[in-house]
Every structure is written in structure tokens, then in C-alpha cells.
């Protein structure tokens, strides 16, 4: 058993049929010695008396809020949560496996630049009685500070018969140098509590590996006189690290006909302009990627040819 | 047919093209190592991230773009760079910084070159003949060093008398390649920045 936060405790249980469970001793936080009784949740049934209560925790029915009273007055509470271990593996029932970039990916994180700011998100089908708390650090043995905000519900989607909820959190490394070469990864730890079930999820990464620039901005077409050709130009996104001559981007330019059957034409270029032969109903799209370290491509910025 | 081709125009910072070739060569070599040594811990997640130049060179600090010198977090470990004689003219200070930066890059390349050559000598003794260093990568390191045109004492190639542990050597190769790739990215950024300046 360990303390998650004040008056909230996590009991780690090997979860299999007829498991013996864990013996837990609760102590009432009071100077009083006599006349103390214990109850569980809203029940008035007295579970025991005395300053300590010994219980055998085997299942969710044994978890919950234990309260010690004296003469009708509440003295203190202890909330017991269960953390299940099945076949030596901690349960992952609360969050959905996003399977990207690999199986057992519950947390996904992205950074728009090298400032040390990043966003993580996760998915669940659970809509109520759900709380999250997020901690992060750079390295684990001698951790350096990363500050995370509160996790918030950021999107709701319907997936078949189910509703899916996306939660996200923003974190910022306390003292980040954009030009630094990372040798210790960022660690992100999410505590998830659904009713009386506790689970924890972790992710470890280097900022350089989770970079995904915003799409190029101000994508514009300028027709060239006496020609079917147009000059396409775009700019670095505002959120990208500066100076741009140091944190350079490369771009993918794509020309796509109206029908998906028409073959695309595409090139990669380090410039922020290109000349394109614009056919009726075609569209021009541009996306960005760090020029020197191949992490994710941005989403596309697109403009119609007409 | 392949005609001899002139080098990029001289207005271009001469090392930029070499540094781009370096990054390409290191990335290719790392990819090859990860494929060939698929049953070894050779991915970014599996290896220890070591920097053989730590405490010996200060490339990141010495080559920091001027725009980032206002960032306190970037100045933490800066002992040498930007601390110059107060009476120096701005242009002299800039050229001094650039010289410091480029000589630091040169020292990095020299250290990695020695490590890679030593390692290759060991790998050539492996009866499995599983992996060797790409000669193109070694040539590209050499080309960039020549383009940087610094003179410094030659570091003797480390030779060891004991029987090499090929498993350890291959893991060390992965560690070295990952670290060198990260340094090659920094070098490319620096060359791009200097070219634009």
C-alpha cells in the first residue's frame, strides 16, 4: 500500500481467482483513543472499533472511503483504491491503446518546436467518475523539472456505438534550450482513477522525436503572365523555432487533380516557393518537416488551383 | 555519362554541402546498423545516450546562434564561448566566435573519426563479418575536416591488445552512431546558419 495523495491510498493486488489479497491496517488520524468506530462509504454498518482497523482487501467491494467516527462526529477519512496486476502486468483498462506508432501506446505526445513545450493526449470510452493527474521530468535518476497543467477533456468523438473521449495536457520544461542536444529523455507519468480503480501510464521520449511543425502559413498562388504556370509561395509557421536559418524546415509540395485516380505530382524542396502548372480543379498542398531531423510531417496546408 | 561536376558556387558557405553529405551518410549508416543488428539493442529507446565529446568540446555552446544567447537556459554551460576580450570589435568578436565554433566542430569530427576507425579495425576481425563502417561515411568526415582546414595534432588510433568483445563493440557502434547523428544535425544547423549570415 502507498499514499497517492493525502488520505488516498493505493493497494496493489495480484488479481486472480481466490487470491489472498492484501492485509491493510488503517489508523484514525486523531488524538482520541476510545469510542472510535469505522464505516465504509455511505453505509452505517460498523466494521470495527478502535484507533486502527485491519482489513483484508481482495476485491473492489473492499475498496472505498473508510471513515472513523466518535459519537456521531467524523474524525478522518482514508480512501482506498485498487491497482490490479494480472499475470505480472498492471491493468490498462481505463485508457484505450492508440496503437500508433506501436502497440501499447496509451499516451501520445507532440511538440510544435524545440522550446521544451509539448502536448500529450490519451483516449478513453469512460465518461464519468474519472480523474487524471500528470507529472513529468527530464530523466528519472536525477530528474530536472517539467511543469504540466491540468488534464482537460479536449474532444469527443463517436466511434460506432461508442463515444470516445480525448483528454490532453500541456507541459513545459522549466529550463529548455532549443539548441540543446538531448541525452536524457522526458518522462511523462499519468495517474488515472476511475471510481475505485487506479492505473498509471508512462511515456518516455526526446523532444526531437515528437516534433511536428504546424502547417506552413500564408500559402498563396500568383499567376505568371502569359503562362499556365503559377508561383506558389508559403512561409514558416509562427510557432516554429527561430532563427529559421538554424532551425530550418524542408517542404513537400504536392499537386493533386480533382479525381483521386489522377496521379499526384510531388517534390521536396528547402525553398519557400515553387512554380506549378495549375490545372482546372487541381489543388496544391504543402507540408513541413524539420530539415535535418526527420520527425513527423506537419498537416497539409492546401489551396485550390482555380 | 558522369561528367566531373564543379563544386557549388563559392558564395555558398563551403562547408554546408559537406555537412549535408555527412548527415546523409551518418543517417544511412545508422539505418544499416539498426537493420543488420536487429537482435542487438540498437534503437534510440534501447541504447544509453553517451557523448564522447562531453567535457572535451563545446560545439552546441560555441556555435549557438546569436538570437539564442539571450536565452538563460542556453547559457548555463557556456564557459568558453562569447566570453571574449571586452575591447574587441563586434566583427572581430563574431569572427572569433565563428573560429571557436568551427574548431570545436573540427575536434568533434577528429574524435569520432578516431573512434570509428578503431572500431572498424575490431569489426574487421569479427569472424561473423556482420557489419563494417561505411567507407563513404569515413570519407565524408575526412572531406568536412579538410574543408574546415584546421591544423591540430593527429590523434593516434587507439589499439588494444586484448581480444575484442564483438557483442560489446557492436553495441558501442550503435551508441556512437546515434550520438554522431545528433551531432551531425547540430553541425548541419550551424552551417546553414553561418551560410545565411
Amino acid at each position: 500500500i502507498w499514499e497517492l495523495k493525502k488520505d488516498v491510498y493505493v493497494v496493489e493486488l495480484d488479481w486472480y481467482p481466490d487470491a489472498p489479497g492484501e492485509m491493510v491496517v488503517l489508523t484514525c488520524d486523531t488524538p482520541e483513543e476510545d469510542g472510535i468506530t469505522w464505516t465504509l462509504d455511505q453505509s452505517s454498518e460498523v466494521l470495527g472499533s478502535g484507533k486502527t482497523l485491519t482489513i483484508q482487501v481482495k476485491e473492489f467491494g473492499d475498496a472505498g472511503q473508510y471513515t472513523c467516527h466518535k459519537g456521531g462526529e467524523v474524525l478522518s477519512h482514508s480512501l482506498l483504491l485498487l491497482h490490479k496486476k494480472e499475470d505480472g502486468i498492471w491493468s490498462t483498462d481505463i485508457l484505450k491503446d492508440q496503437k500508433e506508432p506501436k502497440n501499447k501506446t496509451f499516451l501520445r505526445c507532440e511538440a510544435k518546436n524545440y522550446s521544451g513545450r509539448f502536448t500529450c493526449w490519451w483516449l478513453t470510452t469512460i465518461s464519468t467518475d474519472l480523474t487524471f493527474s500528470v507529472k513529468s521530468s527530464r530523466g528519472s535518476s536525477d530528474p530536472q523539472g517539467v511543469t504540466c497543467g491540468a488534464a482537460t477533456l479536449s474532444a469527443e468523438r463517436v466511434r460506432g456505438d461508442n463515444k470516445e473521449y480525448e483528454y490532453s495536457v500541456e507541459c513545459q520544461e522549466d529550463s529548455a534550450c532549443p539548441a540543446a542536444e538531448e541525452s536524457l529523455p522526458i518522462e511523462v507519468m499519468v495517474d488515472a482513477v476511475h471510481k475505485l480503480k487506479y492505473e498509471n501510464y508512462t511515456s518516455s521520449f526526446f523532444i526531437r522525436d515528437i516534433i511536428k511543425p504546424d502547417p506552413p502559413k500564408n500559402l498563396q498562388l500568383k499567376p505568371l503572365k502569359n503562362s499556365r504556370q503559377v508561383e506558389v509561395s508559403w512561409e514558416y509557421p509562427d510557432t516554429w523555432s527561430t532563427p529559421h536559418s538554424y532551425f530550418s524546415l524542408t517542404f513537400c509540395v504536392q499537386v493533386q487533380g480533382k479525381s483521386k485516380r489522377e496521379k499526384k505530382d510531388r517534390v521536396f524542396t528547402d525553398k519557400t516557393s515553387a512554380t506549378v502548372i495549375c490545372r482546372k480543379n487541381a489543388s496544391i498542398s504543402v507540408r513541413a518537416q524539420d530539415r535535418y531531423y526527420s520527425s513527423s510531417w506537419s498537416e497539409w496546408a492546401s489551396v485550390p488551383c482555380s | 555519362r558522369n561528367l566531373p561536376v564543379a563544386t557549388p558556387d563559392p558564395g555558398m558557405f563551403p562547408c554546408l554541402h559537406h555537412s549535408q553529405n555527412l548527415l546523409r551518410a551518418v543517417s544511412n549508416m545508422l539505418q544499416k546498423a539498426r537493420q543488420t543488428l536487429e537482435f542487438y539493442p540498437c534503437t534510440s529507446e534501447e541504447i544509453d545516450h553517451e557523448d564522447i565529446t562531453k567535457d572535451k568540446t563545446s560545439t552546441v555552446e560555441a556555435c549557438l546562434p546569436l538570437e539564442l544567447t539571450k536565452n538563460e537556459s542556453c547559457l548555463n554551460s557556456r564557459e568558453t564561448s562569447f566570453i571574449t576580450n571586452g575591447s574587441c570589435l563586434a566583427s572581430r568578436k563574431t569572427s572569433f566566435m565563428m573560429a571557436l565554433c568551427l574548431s570545436s566542430i573540427y575536434e568533434d569530427l577528429k574524435m569520432y573519426q578516431v573512434e570509428f576507425k578503431t572500431m572498424n579495425a575490431k569489426l574487421l576481425m569479427d569472424p561473423k563479418r556482420q557489419i563494417f563502417l561505411d567507407q563513404n561515411m569515413l570519407a565524408v568526415i575526412d572531406e568536412l575536416m579538410q574543408a574546415l582546414n584546421f591544423n591540430s595534432e593527429t590523434v593516434p588510433q587507439k589499439s588494444s591488445l586484448e581480444e575484442p568483445d564483438f557483442y560489446k563493440t557492436k553495441i558501442k557502434l550503435c551508441i556512437l552512431l546515434h550520438a554522431f547523428r545528433i551531432r551531425a544535425v547540430t553541425i548541419d544547423r550551424v552551417m546553414s546558419y553561418l551560410n545565411a549570415s
Epitope: - | 561536376v5 557549388p8 554541402h17
Partner: nanobody
């Protein structure tokens, strides 16, 4: 190995036009193609580059708006239409096959195969 042969060069007055052609001995449809030029005593200079399907192009600053590159993959050929020619356009023009299928580059060493070149002279 692809052989390239340029043609269409010659002597032209300033303000005039020329159309250069580059014929390839094998398929060029899966690579970018470029035109470069070299004036006596000067570095080889990037002129234009074209994507595999010919819809995306890039031009050197000195020729933008005056030159137009195109390709015909079925004919295994690329072309360079040069209008409003200036004396400073005088050079040997080379066509080249890019080493990659889809990365634009202005750097000659990023191109694999080169033609022998065709001389363009613009008189004032």
C-alpha cells in the same frame, strides 16, 4: 546508365528566343530533371528543375519569368524554352538526371548523369 544529348543551342541576338532539347537514351520518368549552365571561368549554375510528372518546377533567380522548362516522359525528353535572352545568358547548357526521384536541388553533385552540353551565345 542513361545517356543525355542536348541540342538547340546557337547564336541569337539579345531579346531573342531559343528552345533547347535534351534526349535521353533510357527512361527518365522516375527522376527529377535539371538544367544547368556554365560560362567560361565560372562555376556551374543552376537554371531549372522539374518534377517527375512535370507539374512542379523551380528556376534560378536569374532566369525566373524568362525561361520555361517542360518534359515529355513518353519521348524521354526535357526542354528549356528561353525567351528575352540577355548576353549574360551566354554559356554551355547541360541537362542532368537527379539522383533522387523527388527532391529538388540546385547543387550539381545531387545529379547523376549529364549531357555533353550545348553552347548558347547571346550577342548584344
Amino acid at each position: 546508365e542513361v545517356q543525355l544529348v542536348e541540342s538547340g543551342g546557337g547564336l541569337v541576338q539579345a531579346g531573342g528566343s531559343l528552345r533547347l532539347s535534351c534526349a535521353a537514351s533510357g527512361s527518365i520518368s522516375s527522376n527529377i530533371m535539371g538544367w544547368f549552365r556554365q560560362a567560361p571561368g565560372k562555376e556551374r549554375e543552376f537554371v531549372a528543375v522539374i518534377s517527375r510528372r512535370g507539374l512542379i518546377l523551380d528556376y534560378g533567380d536569374s532566369v525566373k519569368g524568362r525561361f520555361t522548362m517542360s518534359r515529355d516522359n513518353a519521348k524521354k525528353a526535357v526542354y528549356l524554352q528561353m525567351n528575352s535572352l540577355k548576353p549574360e545568358d551566354t554559356a554551355v547548357y547541360y541537362c542532368a538526371v537527379g539522383k533522387t526521384t523527388d527532391r529538388f536541388s540546385e547543387i550539381p553533385s545531387d545529379y547523376d548523369y549529364w549531357g555533353q552540353g550545348t553552347q548558347v551565345t547571346v550577342s548584344s
